[in-house]
């Protein structure tokens, strides 16, 4: 229904706390360089204005759209051109072009320093002094680094953060209470960020239809007892929520997400038997819980998929009459029977089925042509299954760090033109799939591995889009989202690449490496490994292992030495010589 004042409507629906949090996230995601204080001032002004509209919906400007109100605020920021360059040109446009322009200027890799966590005591002090400001800083810092973070979910993580601080700051040993808990939240939030970015990419590149197909598959796996009409309704609503968030309409997105959660909890009987625990929780926890609820038990009496989609005499008639609906029912029926498949795989199967019908239904004898379609799925299913087996075996053999290194070598060979920091970040993220997925039960491994890899590779594509350097990467990133992972997996050594000159300074280290945290040490070593591969793309695994073992030994020796600096300056050049010889 239409409201006289959109801003008053959203303020009333969301309440002041969530309203302010979402406006802060929106501003931080649009203008990623502004300080917290600048954004906090704008948020307060918007909130004060919203309150005047709540008091009187006919007050001046209360009838304006949220994009107009927010855009006007952002465009009024002083020194916009100096700080943001051509983004300032957006302000010469009218809505809706102005908002589209802001969206196009979101930076997936802003040049901001890593979000450093303060020391426990300091954190607790500032949290106790002003919890609201503390949480505001958290929202601002995460949102500006992750401009597509799912806003209502970021409110959930802020709430988690708040609860952890409340609990741990009351403990004697704050540090040991906070560190593992906050690390856990950080890890989950980073995964949430890449997953959501993938959804927005799907929406931006391929439109609502592509996202809705993803949603149908995912929801059908989770709710196999819900009928097709129910799944379609949920998928349509979920598509709207994600479209709004990806489009920067964060107030509408959060409001509609709350509505969807409410609907699901009011209709558990027709959706799933597993929702009650989630539905007992307060709003943010409820919506989060529903988004990752366990799969319902599959109905026992499901007929073979072939009955309706291969053997039925009316396959081509049904397909021709309502292609999207027929393919949707195929995706629904296949997905509800296969919680053990990844969504990407299910979408590839649906695509194969569609291509088969397009070809066969135009022929003289369609049933003879499409009769073998299910058998033709086999190679498509085997490929990711083999990928999971091979990679999980390797992970179990090497551990996370070793597995990351194996992936780093593999991907540097596939795309040696890509910058070393991007390759290291990608390999570290791809390597985490082992820890995340390989320990799961067999039937959960494939969906976990492939859907996570797809999300990470989406980030690789986004970073590469900014500065395209590798034809291999461009080729894989240009195709459909669901084909990306198989495309990257199939890449081999780039034969067109001219090896990098060997530069001794690339492999020269100093004693400061000794005091770095373990993660930073690993990154330094992985940076060296990527550079080695760029110098010798065809080096064997054995050669690289020899060099890296030598390198590790060198670091260990010099970091234990009484005179570290002397050790690094004398042993370093020897290491470089040995490396060159080993790779000759």
């Amino acid at each position: 229904e239409a409201h006289k004042s959109e801003i008053a409507h959203r303020y009333n629906d969301l309440g002041e706390q969530h309203f302010k949090g979402l406006v802060l996230i929106a501003f931080s995601q649009y203008l990623q360089k502004c300080s917290y204080d600048e954004h906090a001032k704008l948020v307060q002004e918007v909130t004060d204005f919203a309150k005047t509209c709540v008091a009187d919906e006919s007050a001046a400007n209360c009838d304006k759209s949220l994009h107009t109100l927010f855009g006007d605020k952002l465009c009024a920021i002083p020194n916009l051109r100096e700080n943001y360059g051509e983004l300032a040109d957006c302000c010469t446009k009218q809505e809706p072009e102005r908002n589209e322009c802001f969206l196009q200027h979101k930076d997936d890799n802003p040049s901001l320093p890593p979000f450093e966590r303060p020391e426990a005591e300091a954190m607790c002090t500032s949290f106790k002094e002003n919890p609201t400001t503390f949480m505001g800083h958290y929202l601002h810092e995460v949102a500006r680094r992750h401009p597509y973070f799912y806003a209502p979910e970021l409110l959930y993580y802020a709430e988690q953060y708040n609860e952890i601080l409340t609990q741990c700051c009351a403990e004697a040993d704050k540090e040991s209470c906070l560190t593992p808990k906050l690390d856990g939240v950080k890890e989950k939030a980073l995964v949430s960020s890449v997953r959501q970015r993938m959804k927005c990419s799907s929406m931006q590149k391929f439109g609502e239809r592509a996202f809705k197909a993803w949603a149908v598959a995912r929801l059908s796996q989770t709710f196999p007892n819900a009928d097709f009409a129910e799944i379609t309704k949920l998928a349509t609503d979920l598509t709207k929520v994600n479209k709004e968030c990806c489009h920067g309409d964060l107030l509408e997105c959060a409001d509609d997400r709350a509505e969807l959660a409410k609907y699901m909890c009011e209709n558990q009987a027709t959706i799933s038997s597993k929702l009650q625990t989630c539905c007992d929780k307060p709003l943010l926890k409820k919506a989060h819980c529903l988004s990752e609820v366990e799969h319902d038990t599959m109905p026992a009496d499901l007929p073979a998929i072939a009955a309706d989609f291969v053997e039925d005499q009316e396959v081509c008639k049904n397909y021709a009459e309502a292609k999207d609906v027929f393919l949707g029912t195929f995706l629904y029926e296949y997905s509800r029977r296969h919680p053990d498949y990844s969504v990407s795989l299910l979408l590839r199967l649906a695509k194969k089925y569609e291509a088969t019908l397009e070809k066969c239904c135009a022929e003289a004898n369609p049933p003879a042509c499409y009769g073998t379609v299910l058998a033709e799925f086999q190679p498509l299913v085997e490929e990711p299954k083999n990928l999971v087996k091979t990679n999980c075996d390797l992970y179990e053999k090497l551990g996370e760090y070793g597995f990351q290194n194996a992936i780093l070598v593999r991907y540097t060979q596939k795309a040696p033109q890509v910058s070393t920091p991007t390759l290291v970040e990608a390999a570290r993220n791809l390597g985490r799939v082992g820890t995340k997925c390989c320990t799961l039960p067999e039937d959960q491994r494939l969906p976990c591995v492939e859907d996570y890899l797809s999300a990470i590779l989406n980030r690789v594509c986004l970073l590469h889009e900014k500065t395209p350097v590798s034809e291999h990467v461009t080729k894989c990133c240009s195709g459909s989202l669901v084909e990306r992972r198989p495309c990257f997996s199939a890449l081999t050594v780039d034969e067109t690449y001219v090896p990098k000159e060997f530069k001794a300074e690339t492999f020269t280290f100093h004693s400061d490496i000794c005091t770095l945290p373990e993660k930073e040490k690993q990154i330094k070593k992985q940076t060296a490994l990527a550079e080695l591969v760029k110098h010798k793309p065809k080096a064997t695994a054995e050669q690289l292992k020899t060099v890296m073992d030598d390198f590790a030994q060198f670091l260990d020796t010099c970091c234990k030495a009484a005179d570290k600096d002397t050790c690094f300056s004398t042993e370093g050049p020897n290491l470089v010589t040995r490396c060159k010889d080993a790779l000759a």
Epitope: K317, A320, A322, V325, C361
Partner: nanobody
Framework: EVQLVESGGGEVQPGGSLRLSCAAS????????MVWVRQAPGKGLEWVST????????VYAESVKGRFTISRDNAKNTVYLQMNSLRAEDTAVYYC????????????????RGQGTLVTVKP
């Protein structure tokens, strides 16, 4: 709103021909499959033929195969049914139809339909 207007019906002798037309509006015609169904006096709806959105796929009921031809012109938002070698049993009201969101595929009572055009085949 969705509108389907059939025309071209009439009285014809057995063995004769007619060409039915259906002008569509109120929906995205070029992405919609189209259907002809018919209803003989005192009978239920019977499916006759279906054509896909891009006209690549055409399907016919056994009773009309080889005699009827379905076609469409997406530029004119029109679907046609060319009926040759007409028989007495082809006498019916012919409806042009398209899928309605939320209905079951093949459940023609629930599809969007026009008012129909009467085809009478008699000596």
């Amino acid at each position: 709103e969705v509108q389907l207007v059939e025309s071209g019906g009439g009285e014809v002798q057995p063995g004769g021909s007619l060409r039915l037309s259906c002008a569509a509006s109120g929906f995205t015609f070029s992405t919609s499959g189209m259907v002809w169904v018919r209803q003989a006096p005192g009978k239920g709806l019977e499916w006759v033929s279906t054509i896909s959105d891009d006209a690549r796929i055409t399907v016919y009921a056994e009773s009309v195969k080889g005699r009827f031809t379905i076609s469409r012109d997406n530029a004119k938002n029109t679907v046609y049914l060319q009926m040759n070698s007409l028989r007495a049993e082809d006498t019916a009201v012919y409806y042009c139809a398209t899928y309605r969101a939320g209905s079951r595929i093949g459940s023609y009572e629930d599809y969007y339909r026009g008012q129909g055009t009467l085809v009478t085949v008699k000596p």
